[in-house]
């Protein structure tokens, strides 16, 4: 960068080098150039020579002010015009930042993904900050007292192997930058709590000549645990609003459900489970997508190994029974 | 050999416009930072808007006097600087010149037009 | 903006004369200062650059010297056509700043 460069002299920022975005800010450069009085000194910022707010304070050093700086990161360098030189000589550069203090974290949600052999820790981390900040996530065994911290930028994943301390942890964590430091409240945490089952996946979709026609949904999880909660929400592709079905599964075969449906309609539905009384859901599935027949033919959609939403074939289909609807999102 | 043709003034009445061009040659247009420096009968230089030099990404500047009133502008293409003047008042009567600048002094100045704001 | 003041406003001399112009800067210019002539109805000319370097084409009798906020321009020996205004112009600081004009007469 900019700070690798020779330099001739000195440039500094004032406050500092990584401000508060918005901050009127001073940029100094000072010359010690041999056989050199500077007759002019020019700041430039990411190449383009700045015109306006220069101030010279001393023989050697001048100042650039600027209002309500907002810009993240900017390349700054300064040059003087020295007598007798034809072409400006460099002084020195610095890359300056700004951007804000982290927000408190909140919403910490810790859980593992079944056969994931990880424990994965997520936050909400508030405001973009625009600068470097880290996450240190402390994890606490509520039984041996003892703390491990585990460094990251984003979200972090803990391998089960090593929380040995038992099953019940405190899990907070604490957002540091240059420009500030805050924590999060303490989540508490059982191992045993906090399982998702392994995903569940639709994999065809069939619609059975009938009286009234029925199309039949196939979905399937690799899940050991045995009482799992499950939701299947389904609708028109042109609907807003989905109708939520709810099931209690057992995973030792494909699951089949049945819904009677409008004809010559697309239809778009997923799949989300939960271990029966716990807290957290899988992510709904990958949207599954089944037109209707016009009339009785049958009709069979299969899911392909691959991301089924950019595929369009493969489909999902929904009841028009009396089902409650409902308009949760993800 | 620098060049520097001004047209477009004459008189006009206070509150109308004006525009008046600068017509360059001999020099490297881009690289040059381009004003327009005004002259009141009898009376001493005045500085009153500035385009800068590529290098400077062609900054404006403007005097108080004329802020918000005056607008300068380069056509690189045509070598050519203009100064749009809105809502003239007796007071902007004067010779306007043309002027070149590389380093921040004027090197060279055009011959100026009158530009005269009466009713 | 940095002020700079001329003086005299005007003086009478005569050919042949020594003639002494000097400009004040309202801070430290670090010779960043030019002088221009300017006659009756023409544009202003460049005479001196960074307060002692003389422009090409201009007579070797006009001269600058100065530094700190103090700058002089000397006509070491007047001529029938140096009769004219003369303007200095600081460009330390931006924006550049005029004085307000020496008018040097015929006595």
């Known amino acids: 960068g900019i700070t690798n460069i020779n330099c001739s002299g000195h440039i500094w920022v004032e406050p500092a080098t990584i401000f508060k975005m918005g901050m009127n800010i001073s940029i100094y450069c000072q010359a010690a150039i041999k056989n050199c009085q500077p007759r002019k000194l020019h700041f430039y910022k990411n190449g383009i020579k700045e015109r306006f707010q220069i101030t010279r304070i001393n023989k050697t050093t001048a100042r650039l002010w600027y209002k309500n700086f907002l810009e993240p990161h900017a390349s700054m360098y300064c040059t003087a015009e020295c007598p007798k030189h034809f072409q400006e000589t460099l002084i020195c550069g610095k890359d300056i930042s700004s951007g804000y203090p982290p927000d408190i974290p909140d919403e910490v949600t810790c859980v593992i993904y079944e056969y994931s052999g990880n424990m994965t820790c997520t936050w909400n981390a508030g405001k973009l900050t625009y600068i470097d900040t880290k996450y240190v996530v402390h994890v606490k065994s509520l039984e041996t007292e003892e703390e491990q911290q585990y460094l990251t930028s984003s979200y972090i994943n803990i391998s089960t192997d090593s929380l040995q301390g038992g099953k019940k942890y405190l899990v907070w964590v604490q957002a540091a930058n240059a420009l500030g430091m805050e924590e999060s409240k303490q989540l508490q945490i059982h191992l045993d709590d906090i399982v998702i089952p392994s995903a569940a996946v639709i994999s065809r979709a069939e619609t059975i000549n009938a009286t009234v026609p029925k199309t039949i949904i196939y979905w399937d999880s690799q899940t050991t645990i045995e009482k799992v909660s499950c939701e299947m929400r389904y609708k028109a592709t042109t609907n807003q609003t989905w109708n939520v079905k709810e099931f209690d599964t057992n995973f030792t075969y494909v699951q089949q459900s049945e819904f009677y449906l409008e004809p010559n309609i697309k239809y778009v539905f997923q799949v989300r489970c939960q271990e029966t009384g716990k807290r957290y859901w899988q992510p709904w599935s990958s949207p599954f997508f089944h037109k209707t027949p016009e009339t009785v033919p049958q009709v069979t959609s299969k899911a392909f190994q691959h991301d089924t939403w950019n595929s369009g074939l493969t489909v999902a289909s929904i009841s028009t029974g009396h089902l409650t609807s409902d308009n949760r999102g993800d | 050999q620098v060049q520097l043709v001004e047209s477009g003034g004459g008189v006009v009445q206070p509150g109308r416009s004006l525009r008046l061009s600068c017509a360059a040659s001999g020099f490297d247009f881009n690289s040059y930072g381009m004003s327009w420096v005004r002259q009141a009968p009898g009376k001493g230089l005045d500085l009153v808007a500035d385009?800068?030099?590529?290098?400077?990404?062609?900054?404006?500047y403007y005097a108080d006097s004329v802020k918000d009133r005056f607008t300068i502008s380069r056509d690189n293409s045509k070598n050519t600087l203009y100064l749009q003047m809105n809502s003239l008042r007796a007071e902007d009567t004067a010779v306007y010149y043309c002027?070149?600048?590389?380093?921040?002094?004027?090197?060279?100045w055009g011959q100026g037009t009158l530009v005269t704001v009466s009713s | 903006d940095i002020q700079m003041t001329q003086s005299p406003s005007s003086l009478s001399a005569s050919v042949g004369d020594r003639v002494t112009i000097t400009c004040r800067a309202s801070?430290?210019?670090?010779?960043?200062l030019a002088w221009y002539q300017q006659k009756p109805g023409k544009a202003p000319k460049l005479l001196i650059y960074h307060a002692s370097s003389l422009q090409s084409g201009v007579p070797s009798r006009f001269s600058g010297s100065g530094s700190g906020t103090d700058y002089t321009l000397t006509i070491s020996s007047l001529q029938p056509e140096d009769f004219a205004t003369y303007y200095c112009?600081?460009?330390?600081?931006?924006?550049?700043?005029f004085g307000q004009g020496t008018k040097v007469e015929i006595k």
């Open positions: 002027a070149v600048h590389h380093s921040d002094y004027f090197e060279y």
């Open positions: 112009l600081q460009d330390s600081e931006y924006p550049p700043t």
């Open positions: 385009i800068n030099s590529k290098s400077y990404n062609y900054a404006t």
């Open positions: 801070q430290d210019i670090y010779t960043n």
